[in-house]
């Protein structure tokens, strides 16, 4: 009976449910288009349960299919600003290991100041996700305007 | 053996899977920026399994991490209208209890007539979510254009 | 004890976790606004675990509440192009069986070149989802710009 009891933990402990929601920490230095993220209850409503941060980039700890979602809002932005500084583009991709490098999700701002999207994608343990923002406009660091997260969905 | 059997119900019964998808009922009176929601199979494809509606606002019944998503489309809207009535902003937040009041998700329409986004956030039993639409434009009540939902993801 | 062991498979095998992420294959012939999808590991990062494709349209194999998500980016598009070719609209709906035909999700491009959204909706075994793109602009087939997916959430 004890074995059946222990097995009950599978969904949460062994099977997955890895999840993370991150807030923007800072942008990279010039020539580095990556956004650098941070997470943890001390910072507000961001958290990491399973995945980890590696120098501000999100590293996956469990193989599976994940729902990846992101919202980025440009600070000091109006539709005029956005169109004048076009193209401003956000791309989410696997940036390491190099052998698995691929763009997963890409959006342009055009005349808007916010992009938001989500997708399902297979990710493997060790995959590091990078979010590249190209253009001169900077993202808002407000936690309700800019965030990035993943949710393990199934093996 | 019966105990192991009963335990099998955990994922659905005890562990969570609370979920709700709501459709717009009406906007608030002047000076009340909140959108008022409704849900239930008699209304179409909206539903509440766990969370409840309290005067048109969504109240959470189970602690956990939730995926919150929303789409709002402005009625009688073109990109010209949207920019002329800028700023029109949508914010989703915890509005009660007051001690936990916080904005979770915020988007401006700029030159667009629809906003859509989603995020992961910890919510606690008793948290009431409010969706505030500021500006003079009214939202569409078409069920495929304006909707709001939550999905329990993990404890 | 063996019975309790077998039951552990419920979440993955019996209980659901049907999931699919598709990439654009092609648009329909004139007068057919539907987008035709494809999926499978040989094509990249698209997949079908449970649902199936029927002539490029997604058919559901398990009753339940699903998270449906989509992103469509218009090819050869700028905010000027998008507004000049307005209205360009995307609608996701159940297109068969005819008795259950309904629009689930609808968005216009206005001055933008990408739409992205998601919603929870009940779907039944045999429901076929169609994605209709109306207007003269064509969607990008880049797999990080245009995709469509569903995720089983609960019974």
């Amino acid at each position: 009976q004890r074995f059946a009891q222990a097995q009950q933990q599978l969904p949460l402990e062994s099977l997955g449910w890895d999840v993370a929601e991150l807030q923007l920490n800072h942008t990279g230095p010039q020539q580095d288009p990556r956004l650098y993220w941070q997470g943890g209850p001390a910072l507000g409503r961001s958290f990491l349960h399973g995945p980890e941060l590696d120098k501000g980039q999100l590293r996956i700890h469990r193989d599976g299919i994940y729902m990846v979602h992101i919202q980025v809002t440009l600070a000091i932005c109006s539709s005029t600003t956005a169109s004048r500084h076009h193209p401003t583009t956000l791309a989410v991709g696997i940036c390491s290991p190099a052998s698995r490098s691929i763009s997963l999700l890409r959006l342009s701002f055009h005349q808007g100041c916010t992009i938001a999207s989500q997708r399902l994608t297979p990710l493997a343990r060790g995959d590091t996700l990078c979010t590249n923002l190209t253009g001169t406009l900077l993202p808002s660091r407000n936690t309700d305007e800019t965030f990035f997260g993943v949710q393990w969905v199934r093996p | 053996q019966r105990f192991a059997q009963a335990q099998q119900q955990l994922p659905l019964e005890s562990l969570g899977w609370d979920v709700a998808e709501l459709q717009l009922n009406h906007t608030g009176p002047q000076q009340d920026p909140r959108l008022y929601w409704q849900g239930g199979p008699a209304l179409g494809r909206s539903f509440l399994h766990g969370p409840e509606l309290d005067k048109g606002q969504l109240r959470i019944h189970r602690d956990g991490i939730y995926m919150v998503h929303i789409q709002v489309t402005l009625a009688i809207c073109s990109s010209t209208t949207a920019s002329r009535h800028h700023p029109t902003t949508l914010a989703v937040g915890i509005c009660s209890p007051a001690s936990r009041s916080i904005s979770l998700l915020r988007l401006s329409f700029h030159q667009g007539c629809t906003i859509a986004s989603q995020r992961l956030t910890p919510l606690a039993r008793g948290d009431t979510l409010c969706t505030n639409l500021t500006g003079t434009l009214l939202p569409s009540r078409n069920t495929d254009e304006t909707f709001f939902g939550v999905q329990w993801v993990r404890p | 004890q063996r019975f309790a062991q077998a039951q552990q498979q419920l979440p993955l095998e019996s209980l659901g976790w049907d999931v699919a992420e598709l990439q654009l294959n092609h648009t329909g012939p004139q007068q057919d606004p539907r987008l035709y999808w494809q999926g499978g590991p040989a094509l990249g990062r698209s997949f079908l675990h449970g649902p199936e494709l029927d002539k490029g349209q997604l058919r559901i194999h398990r009753d339940g509440i699903y998270m449906v998500h989509i992103q469509v980016t218009l090819a050869i598009c700028s905010s000027t192009t998008a507004s000049r070719h307005h209205p360009t609209t995307l609608a996701v709906g159940i297109c068969s069986p005819a008795s259950r035909s309904i629009s689930l999700l609808r968005l216009s491009f206005h001055q933008g070149c990408t739409i992205a959204s998601q919603r929870l909706t009940p779907l039944a075994r045999g429901d076929t989802l169609c994605t209709n793109l109306t207007g003269t602009l064509l969607p990008s087939r880049n797999t990080d710009e245009t995709f469509f997916g569903v995720q089983w959430v609960r019974p």
Partner: antibody, heavy 122, light 107 residues
């Protein structure tokens, strides 16, 4: 077009409280995108940020003045105000109100009032 | 707090010449740096935000560059109305701070 206008006494005695009001037109202090701020400039010197108030009522002050400064907002009048307690002659300056655009970590100022000179003298 | 040091304190140039103003931060401010112009008896006016983005209505002769700790404001060809004091300001973190200013005067 957003316009800001400072008002208040031009002369304040040492140890008293300096009180200024900024009236906003062409925009709303209730907007959830802007940080309504006060900045001062002593005669012939540089600019010093004093603090801001956000639509929600949250405030942020310069630590060098934190114990003496209070910023408040009156959304019904579309105004925000500055109070600086226990003033000395070192507080003599032109005081500007301004609209801050950016995020909760920091803003820059895209619209300014014309400024009002406040002299601290007995 | 982050200290911003502007140099030179005064720049004497003739109309039509190129002006190069420098702002150095005591620690990295990423690209969160703005430039303002102030004329006597007037409020400052925002020229550049976030290192390189021209504010609405600012002529193309004004440009900003830099990242981290070193920033530059360039006026490609000075017009008579450009003679004024210029301030940099960081919004990387609180408290917001301004540089001491550079006066651009007619030679």
């Amino acid at each position: 077009q957003v316009q800001l206008q400072e008002s208040g006494p031009g002369l304040v005695k040492p140890s008293e409280t300096l009180s200024l009001t900024c009236t906003v037109s062409g925009g709303s202090v209730s907007s959830d995108y802007y940080y309504w701020s006060w900045i001062r400039q002593p005669p012939g010197k540089g600019l010093e940020w004093l603090g801001y108030i956000y639509y929600s009522g949250s405030t942020n002050y310069n630590p060098s003045l934190k114990s003496r400064v209070t910023i408040s907002v009156d959304t019904s009048k579309n105004q925000f105000s500055l109070k600086l307690r226990s003033v000395t002659t070192a507080d003599t300056a032109v005081y500007y109100c301004a609209r801050g655009d950016g995020d909760f970590m920091g803003v820059c100022f895209d619209y300014w009032g014309q400024g009002t000179l406040v002299t601290v003298s007995s | 707090e982050i200290v911003l040091t502007q140099s030179p304190a005064t720049l004497s140039l003739s109309p039509g010449e190129r002006a190069t103003l420098s702002c150095r931060a005591s620690q990295s401010v990423s690209s969160y740096l703005a430039w303002y112009q102030q004329k006597p008896g007037q409020a400052p006016r925002l020229l550049i935000f976030d290192a390189s983005n021209r504010a609405t209505g600012i002529p193309a002769r004004f440009s900003g560059s830099g990242s981290g700790t070193d920033f530059t404001l360039t006026i490609s060809s000075l017009e008579p109305e450009d003679f004024a004091v210029y301030y940099c300001q960081q919004r990387s973190n609180w408290p917001l701070t301004f540089g001491g200013g550079t006066k651009v005067e007619i030679k």
